[in-house]
Interface confidence: medium
Amino acid sequence: TEVKVIQPEKSVSVAAGDSTVLNCTLTSLLPVGPIRWYRGVGQSRQLIYSFTTEHFPRVTNVSDATKRSNLDFSIRISNVTPEDAGTYYCVKFQRGSPDTEIQSGGGTEVYVLAK
């Protein structure tokens, strides 16, 4: 069966300066390929986190994605700013040249509240 990307929260609210967790789990690790988080959709979407060796300031993975059986690809955004507001999508790719997007979560909207 086709892999599903599940983002159970429709939205989260976080105060500026605090941290928030955006949850994402997969039903399978197959087909082989990376998982990436984006803010927004379409051509203008912004890469927020990739479960690879890249370093993303303020964004970390919640559980150890290097473990073979791990299906949790949640992220934590620290020191949230008003500019972090938007809808975040957890996206599964199939490895290739280039990688192909095969499934996206339903999106989680982040609301940033004034401190």
Partner: antibody, heavy 119, light 108 residues
Framework: DVQLVESGGGVVRPGESLRLSCAAS????????MNWVRQAPGEGLEWVSL????????YYADSVKGRFTISRDNSKNTLYLQMNSLRAEDTAVYYC????????????WGLGTLVTVSS | ETVLTQSPGTLTLSPGERATLSCRAS??????LAWYQEKPGQAPRLLIY???SRATGVPDRFSGSGSGTEFTLTISSLQSEDFAVYYC??????????FGGGTKVEIK
């Protein structure tokens, strides 16, 4: 107080159409995703359809896909369900249900409207 | 699609007794599970969300527990108004949203 009032139910023949309405009050209607859930006589609850607050995102149960159309008019605080090509198995009480703002559970329901499809 | 199985189908008890209702999911839904009460001629009512959080105005004799695939709704001491049908619903997976088949709690 949140209120959801369904209307438009009735008795129709197989193949005919019906449009259900749900008038909402007591909350900012356009900010919430809305659903239709039905219950056939003597049966359990069955989710039918979902529409996002803006109307941009829509889902249907496989059993009604291609026959039912969900819509909303945020200026009138009203949710609709257009039901075409009705079948006997669509006979049920149809409930309008408001979703929680963060998760897809239903924090308020209407009393329902009965749709009977019979020849 | 996540299938929810409720048991028993019917629970026959006396007022003051403890009711234990079960809901089993075909795959993990973590704690993304809600319970509803339905009475004839009334709108269904949200009782529990997040597997264990009581909705506003719900008496504390109602409690929910469980995570993953096994969930329980407990009514500590049945009152006359608690005799009704109870449904669980998962909201972990994106639509289709699924309900259990229901458990009827009836008076002995």
């Amino acid at each position: 107080d949140v209120q959801l009032v369904e209307s438009g139910g009735g008795v129709v023949r197989p193949g005919e159409s019906l449009r259900l309405s749900c008038a909402a009050s007591g909350f900012t209607f356009s900010s919430y995703d809305m659903n239709w859930v039905r219950q056939a006589p003597g049966e359990g609850l069955e989710w039918v359809s979902l529409i996002s607050g803006s109307g941009e995102i829509i889902y249907y149960a496989d059993s009604v896909k291609g026959r039912f159309t969900i819509s909303r008019d945020n200026s009138k605080n009203t949710l609709y369900l257009q039901m075409n090509s009705l079948r006997a198995e669509d006979t049920a009480v149809y409930y309008c249900a408001k979703e929680n703002n963060r998760y897809r559970f239903f924090d308020y329901w209407g009393l329902g409207t009965l749709v009977t499809v019979s020849s | 699609e996540t299938v929810l199985t409720q048991s028993p189908g019917t629970l026959t008890l006396s007022p003051g007794e403890r009711a234990t209702l079960s809901c089993r999911a075909s795959q993990s839904v973590y704690t993304y599970l809600a319970w509803y009460q339905e009475k004839p001629g009334q709108a269904p009512r949200l009782l529990i969300y997040g597997a264990s959080s009581r909705a506003t105005g719900v008496p504390d004799r109602f409690s929910g527990s469980g995570s993953g695939t096994e969930f329980t709704l407990t009514i500590s001491s049945l009152q006359s108004e608690d005799f009704a049908v109870y449904y669980c619903q998962q909201y972990y997976d994106r639509p289709p949203l699924t309900f259990g088949g229901g458990t009827k709690v009836e008076i002995k």
